[in-house]
């Protein structure tokens, strides 16, 4: 574990003076209400801050907004409220920032009840100027930018109209009525569900899934009897009401809805749900809820077609009531995911997978840590990390686990060491190898963030009392130094750094409270002088990811290949820099049976790596059918795991079997397949804002 404050640590010299010279305070001339902050563009230094103070009156909401802009990462702010004509901005829509570096911003204004439509303020120059535009409708949702072209916007109206703008919100056209949900697909495609009877809430399960590829000139109904739909990676999913009408099944398309296949997943009843936990162009993690109010379900992982699924994890915690799951993609190391299971004794336990859901294991506890009171055996226990479920249940957990793709191997999380997640005060744990090993880095709950691609970690203690101290580490959480950033403590509300973890700046947000007033205040600290030199070749060392046993020649092989990274030495105090690119090199592994999943019609008996044929498909628990092309109906029993790059070694070829005669389905009949069909789950932008923080891809 990390050396304590008194132990010999690689101290950064003269850091107090260096940080004091780079600490910038800004007091906002506002009554304290709510504050929201957005970065505009990447590496631009532009931050927009919207403060709102509103008093709900019986008839209407009286409020005041102020808009501030910084172009130096938050060191200085300018009040630009006059650019939006001192208008009250609706905070529930936030600030809609355009994709990539488009510099586009849309703010949605609060308008009086009798007005014909809403009002937006648009900027396409990183919020230097805004144009006021009156809308011909009242928006129900935030404006959705097309990922391919930020001039194209999509919005739903309060009357369920689907509106499109092709000139960045200057002119709007209603392209369809009675729309329940709309999403941008690939290449400018728009998918939406519509109910021609007019109601979205009562008739779920009777919706049509439609598609337009020309922004509303023409439409194609790609599936019927839809309960919900989503997009994830290359997959379009729909959950479809079955013939019996009480069950739903997942259908999947990889050609934008032209053709569909039924996913080999159990159908669910009205009290259950499907949820796509993660998806990319290669595979899908799908949660299928158990019947009843169990609070758990099963995770399945798909093949590359999104149709054949293997059971990955049973008793996966996913509350039916609030929709919380602890499922997290550890983005700092390929193939790593963590989540929680609900044990038979109703305790919540953390598990981790290092191979994209192939196997789940408990998290190894730090070497020198003691097991807490939840442990039956004081010597044998594991680390349990807090995520969305802990936060939802009101535990003292201020943040979800944190990892960044450019801070290789680094994971920060709150946790406890025992047999299950503890309700006691958590500590902060850090892993530098993607979750294989952990150290206890900080006592008690903290807010934390990663700067300079992992070169610095900053943390602030979570406290109900005013604070004036931050902690920082330049060696991936082993040693910490403290810095008093102000003489006058503030009530802390948030830690903000530019998304992407490339910045050297951190902003501490809070408010000061005096006898009569309270004011927003921010402190922005630039760490550039702490890391005074640029990192050189000698500052980096090779690291083989997923290495657990160097004597094994296949050590580090995950999904058919090893990856070697160049990583910053813990002893090096230097800047990776904003342009830092992770240096990694792959090395292909020999194939083994573990590199293959069982194809449709085959399964793996327990404790066996071979796929054997299912004796009886008809009426099987997991019904599945592939229609159309002949080659879809032949199999050799094995299919390479999505993303697996192994070569040579085991090549499990069997004679090709034609499964046409064995394949049955109650849900769809072949003749309907190409005209109308049904889908399942999927993509970015969930149906429920609860999932935004965790990036849950889709929840019915």
């Amino acid at each position: 574990s990390a050396p304590g404050e008194d132990e010999e640590c690689g101290r950064v010299r003269d850091f107090v003076a260096k940080l004091a010279n780079n600490t910038h305070q800004h007091v906002f001339d506002d009554l304290r209400g709510s504050v929201s902050l957005s970065w505009v563009g990447d590496s631009t230094g532009v931050i927009l801050v919207l403060t709102t103070f509103h008093v709900p009156l019986v008839i209407m909401t009286f409020g005041q907004s102020k808009l501030y802009r910084s172009e130096d990462y938050g060191k200085n702010f300018k009040d630009i409220t006059d650019l939006i004509n001192n208008t009250f901005i609706r905070t529930e829509f936030g600030m809609a920032i355009g994709p990539e570096n488009s510099g586009k911003v849309v703010l949605t204004a609060e308008v009086s009840g009798g007005s014909r439509g809403g009002r937006i303020f648009r900027s396409s120059d990183f919020a230097k100027n805004f144009v006021q535009t009156d809308l011909p409708f009242h928006p129900l949702t935030q404006m959705m930018y097309s990922p391919q072209n930020s001039d194209y916007l999509l919005a739903l109206s309060t009357e369920n109209g689907l509106w499109v703008s092709k000139n960045f919100g200057g002119k709007w056209e209603e392209i369809h009525k009675t729309v329940c949900l709309a999403k941008w697909g690939r290449k400018g495609t728009i998918f939406f569900t519509a109910n021609h009877n007019g109601s979205c809430s009562n008739d779920r399960g009777m919706l049509e899934l439609e598609r337009t590829t020309d922004y509303g000139k023409s439409f194609k109904t790609v599936a019927s009897k839809i309960y919900s739909f989503g997009l994830g990676g290359k997959f379009l999913f729909a959950s479809v009401m079955t013939g019996k009408g009480t069950l739903r099944a997942i259908h999947v398309s990889v050609d934008d809805g032209d053709t569909w296949n039924m996913a080999q997943l159990p159908p669910v009843g009205h009290e259950q749900f499907y949820s796509i936990l993660a998806a990319n162009d290669e595979m899908v993690f799908m949660h299928v809820d158990e019947p009843g109010d169990s609070g758990f379900g099963t995770i399945y992982v798909s093949d590359d077609r999104g149709t054949v699924y293997s059971k990955s994890l049973e008793r996966h915690l996913y509350t039916t009531t609030g929709g919380e799951t602890d499922f997290i993609n550890v983005t700092s190391l390929r193939g790593v995911f963590t989540t929680s299971i609900l044990a038979e004794d109703k305790s919540v336990q953390s598990v981790i997978s290092f191979d994209q859901g192939g196997e789940w294991v408990p998290l190894r506890k730090p070497a020198d840590s003691k097991c807490d009171a939840t442990a039956r055996d004081p010597e044998k226990c594991s680390l349990h990390i807090h995520a969305a479920y802990s936060i939802a249940t009101g535990l003292n957990v201020p943040m979800l686990p944190l990892s960044e793709p450019n801070a290789v191997g680094l994971v920060l999380a709150h946790g406890s060491v025992g047999d299950a997640i503890s309700v006691m005060r958590p500590d902060v744990y850090v892993s530098d190898d993607g979750g294989y090993t952990w150290i206890k880095a900080l006592e008690g709950p903290h807010y934390y963030t990663i700067l300079d691609s992992g070169g610095i970690i900053v943390a602030i203690e979570h406290s109900s009392r005013p604070i004036n101290v931050i902690k920082f580490s330049t060696d991936e959480g082993q040693c910490w130094q403290t810095y008093t950033f102000t003489r006058d403590p503030i009530y802390f509300t948030g830690l903000a750094s530019e998304p992407g973890a490339r910045s050297m700046n951190i902003s501490i947000w809070g408010f000061t409270e005096s006898f009569l007033t309270s004011q927003w205040v921010s402190y922005t600290i630039d760490f550039k002088d702490i890391l005074e030199r640029n990192c050189e070749e000698k500052d980096y060392t090779i690291w083989l990811a997923h290495s657990t046993d160097p004597e094994d020649y296949e050590d580090g092989c995950i999904l058919g290949y090893k990856e070697q990274f160049l990583r910053l030495r813990k002893s090096s105090v230097c800047q990776n820099g904003r342009d830092y690119v992770v240096t990694k090199q792959p090395s292909i592994c020999l194939c083994s049976l573990e590199d293959f999943l069982c194809d449709f019609g085959y399964y793996r008996p327990e404790n066996d790596s071979k796929c054997v044929e299912q004796p009886e498909l008809k009426g099987h628990d997991l019904e599945f059918c592939l229609y159309g092309r002949e080659e879809h109906l032949t199999t050799n029993g094995y299919r390479k795991i999505p993303g697996d790059k192994c070569q040579g070694g085991v090549n499990p070829v069997r004679e090709v079997k034609d499964l046409k005669k064995k394949c049955t389905s109650n849900f769809l009949s072949p003749e309907k397949q190409n005209s109308k069909s049904n889908g399942s789950a999927g993509g970015s932008g969930g149906l429920n804002d609860i999932f935004e923080a965790q990036k849950i891809e889709w929840h019915e």
């Epitope: 190898d433 060392t541 090779i542 690291w543 083989l544 990811a545 290495s547 657990t548 046993d549 160097p550 004597e551 094994d552 020649y553 050590d555 580090g556 090893k562 070697q564 090199q585 792959p586 090395s587 292909i588 020999l590 040579g648």
Partner: antibody, heavy 124, light 108 residues
Amino acid sequence: EVQLVESGGGLVKPGGSLRLSCAASGFTFSSYSMNWVRQAPGKGLEWVSSISSSSSYIYYADSVKGRFTISRDNAKNSLYLQMNSLRAEDTAVYYCARRRIAAAGTGYGAFDIWGQGTMVTVSS
Amino acid sequence: ARQLTQSPSSLSASVGDRVTITCRASQGITSALAWYQQKPGKVPKLLIYDASSLESGVPSRFSGSGSGTDFTLTISSLQPEDFATYYCQQFNGYPMFSFGQGTKLEII
């Protein structure tokens, strides 16, 4: 002094068997992967076989697979190579070599200590 | 096909020369490469491991570089005792632990 000493080489007829031994001293033998490498007269080095510290992982070159068996006795600080069905092309100096391995993830190691070699001649 | 190809197979040089020997892998092997020196009738001696790390006790005129598929061993200023055969060996590809065919460094 860290040392590896091979023994057991000699002249053997094609189809015959031979057992090579390697005695280790001066280091904790049970902590290291061990290897056999051979060198035919006037030729280059050829890796033959490898065994991990606790014998969990055993690897062979394709040219000897099914004919040679590597083993070790950590209590005796000894490494062995049982060679069956010997062929003329197995004629070589056989070296015993230690593989030094870094901590997990931090490097790939190398054959840092070599024995002086023992000559195996397969001829009728 | 051979996993590792060394070039040149032989090389003549003079004392004080800077000499470079290359080793090419048929597939990426990250930094999992070592270099050895063998003198006639002697045992191979480790020079470089992990592609660029100098083995303890080896003179600093020896250096290694490269990663992925292309690697080099450089002797910055040849000494009389450096005339020998040099082998590269990989620890991350197939066939396992395979050696290059060797480069014989001779005196002019």
